[in-house]
Interface confidence: low
């Protein structure tokens, strides 16, 4: 391509006329601001092609780039084009106008950019300033392009003096965009609501500044659109939030709510979904089984736990024998109900160092304005057995009796055993169990009493021994669910009667 005049920079006078010629071995064309101005194209007898661009009545607005390029680039190097820059110094034109999008310069990384403020006269001195500052910034200026450098997120203006007047350019805004892979989170104020209550969902994107939110939800499918609200969380940089608010929910609003977020710079997208349940009214539901009979061991601590689901949050009360329980100042009873998830609760009654008096009928009641549930159980205090008395007597009948008395809860079992060889018993020889009906030499009589006040059983057992001919170790063992206790007595034979 051959351009005349060759440039690459021309300074032309205002109101003048100027002719640009471009020729080449294939059809050629002049371009100005991505368009083809009116021009004369011709083909010479030697086969060369030319295009003549006539610029008439020049003004400052004709300042800029002119390109000559092949009209049809098939089979040709696409990069073959000639650039010419023309200045038309014009005191009536300050800075050349910019398209609106040139005033906003977006960056996704730290890189050199150009603030494209250009003048019509290459002799003018142009300076760059922050919009609210007078100090000229030390940034190199190219009359054909503007100021190039690395800029912070600020507003900038260019200044020049034409004759005796100072001229300011439009403001240029530099934005460094935060762009990263999209990470969306969706949450709801409540995932369970009653009809008539509000559904409020929030979709939050972190690490991006320019994103588009799109919600899908049950109402949308029936053509009833809800306008979301988007805001920036000012206290958290690069957190953008879209809020979907549905007032006065209906049963049909139950379902999946999806937030889809797209980021246009790198064309990333992500979506998250959440399920919302609209119920006609609140509910309280017990989860799991709690037996109607519960046990606690005397002087030990015991926690009774009830798990339930509820919405809205319920009031929880505990009762013992129809009297309301509260945390005791002495620390003997502790009540707690904790929210383990949005609608799941665990209520605990802790009895510290359990006393006999704490046995009884317990009820937990959970309720709110829509529903209630109650759960009752009997608490039995288990008391380890203890042998209170083991005594031997010689009634006139000639037989010998051993009496064993003990207490415990639940009812203790009694086991009698005896050992005849005192030296070897019980380490080497196992004791013999007594009281079986097949044994004629011993008889057993056992009585059981329940003491209401102490809430425990008393067992009294009498062992009758028919023939004791040598010392005998007799052992009474009481056993129940929470322990056992043993006592031992040596029974000696009756001495022979004294004869005169």
């Amino acid at each position: 391509l051959v351009v005349t005049p060759p440039g690459p920079e021309l300074v032309l006078n205002v109101s003048s006329t100027f002719v640009l010629t471009c020729s080449g071995s294939a059809p050629v064309v002049w371009e100005r601001m991505s368009q083809e101005p009116p021009q004369e194209m011709a083909k010479a007898q030697d086969g060369t092609f030319s295009s003549v661009l006539t610029l008439t009545n020049l003004t400052g607005l004709d300042t800029g780039e002119y390109f000559c390029t092949h009209n049809d680039s098939r089979g040709l190097e696409t990069d073959e084009r000639k650039r010419l820059y023309i200045f038309v110094p014009d005191p009536t034109v300050g800075f050349l106008p910019n398209d609106a999008e040139e005033l906003f310069i977006f960056l996704t990384e730290i890189t050199e950019i150009t603030i494209p403020c250009r003048v019509t006269d290459p002799q003018l001195v142009v300076t760059l300033h922050e919009k609210k500052g007078d100090v000229a910034l030390p940034v190199p200026y190219d009359h054909q392009r503007g100021f190039s450098g690395i800029f912070e997120d600020r507003s900038y203006i260019c200044k020049t003096t034409i004759g005796d007047r100072e001229v300011d350019s439009d403001a240029y805004y530099v934005y460094r965009l935060q762009v990263s892979s999209i990470n969306v989170s969706v949450n709801a104020v409540q995932t369970v609501v009653r009809q008539g209550e509000n559904i409020t969902l929030m979709c939050i994107v972190i690490g991006n500044e320019v994103v588009n939110f799109e919600w899908t939800y049950p109402r949308k499918e029936s053509g009833r659109l809800v306008e979301p609200v988007t805001d920036f969380l000012l206290d958290m940089p690069y957190h953008i939030r879209s809020i979907l608010h549905i007032p006065s929910a209906e049963l049909e609003d139950s379902g999946t709510y999806t937030c889809n977020v797209t980021e246009s710079v790198n064309d990333h997208q992500d979506e998250k979904a959440i399920n919302i349940t609209v119920v006609e009214s609140g509910y309280v539901r017990l989860l799991g089984e709690v037996g109607t009979l519960q046990f606690a061991e005397l002087h030990r601590s015991r926690t009774l736990q009830v798990v339930f689901e509820a919405y809205p949050p319920p009031t929880v009360l505990w009762f013992k024998d129809n009297r309301t329980l509260g945390d005791s100042s002495a620390g003997e009873i502790a009540l707690s109900t904790r929210n383990v998830s949005e609608t799941r609760y665990v209520s605990e009654l802790t009895l510290v160092r359990v006393k006999v008096a704490e046995a009884g009928h317990y009820t937990m009641r959970a309720f709110h304005e829509d529903a209630e549930v109650q759960l009752s159980f009997q608490l039995q205090i288990n008391v380890p057995v203890r042998v209170l008395e083991l005594s031997e007597s010689h009634p006139d009948s000639g037989e010998q009796t051993v009496r064993c008395r003990g207490r415990g809860m639940p009812q203790p079992n009694i086991i009698w055993s005896a050992c005849r060889d005192l030296k070897r018993c019980p380490r080497e020889l196992p004791p013999t169990l007594l009281g079986n009906s097949s044994e004629e030499e011993s008889q057993l009589e056992t009585n059981v009493t329940y003491w209401e006040e102490e809430q425990e059983f008393e067992v009294v057992s009498t062992l009758r021994l028919q023939h004791v001919d040598r010392p005998l170790s007799v052992r009474c063992t009481l056993r129940n669910a929470v322990g056992q206790d043993t006592q031992e007595v040596i029974v000696v034979p009756h001495s022979l009667p004294f004869k005169v």
Epitope: E280, G282, A371
Partner: nanobody, 124 residues
Framework: EVQLVESGGGLVQAGGSLRLSCAAS????????MAWFRQAPGKERDFVAS????????YYADSAQGRFTISRDSAKNTVYLEMNSLKPEDTAVYYC?????????????????WGQGTQVTVSS
């Protein structure tokens, strides 16, 4: 003024069935909860079953589950309690109740309006 009138009570053998009716009048009952309660001699009034007027959601006491069925006929403004496999312990005065807050259908007391009751006696 809301009025509730119960009927259908009577004497029945154990194992038998009865159908109680509650005629409601005085207003439209959309948004209401309707319920049946019962009171045996010398005992407190106990919840039996409930239903929401608009949507027909139901709720039963443990003692009624599987044997009793609550229903409503909006056109006739009537609530029913179908009672099968009756036992002597079902003997009581049965009351119809209504509350303007439908969401109360799972609550076991505190209904705003009550009927006069109908006697059910189950003999062994």
């Amino acid at each position: 003024e809301v009025q509730l009138v119960e009927s259908g009570g009577g004497l029945v053998q154990a194992g038998g069935s009865l159908r109680l009716s509650c005629a409601a009048s005085g207003r439209t009952f959309n948004g209401y909860a309707m319920a049946w309660f019962r009171q045996a001699p010398g005992k407190e009034r106990d919840f039996v079953a409930s239903i929401t007027w608009s949507y027909g959601y139901t709720y039963y006491a443990d003692s009624a589950q599987g044997r009793f069925t609550i229903s409503r006929d909006s056109a006739k403004n009537t609530v029913y309690l179908e009672m099968n496999s009756l036992k002597p312990e079902d003997t009581a005065v049965y009351y119809c109740a209504a509350d303007p807050k439908a969401s109360r259908f799972r609550i076991l007391r505190q209904y705003a309006h009550w009927g006069q009751g109908t006697q059910v006696t189950v003999s062994s």
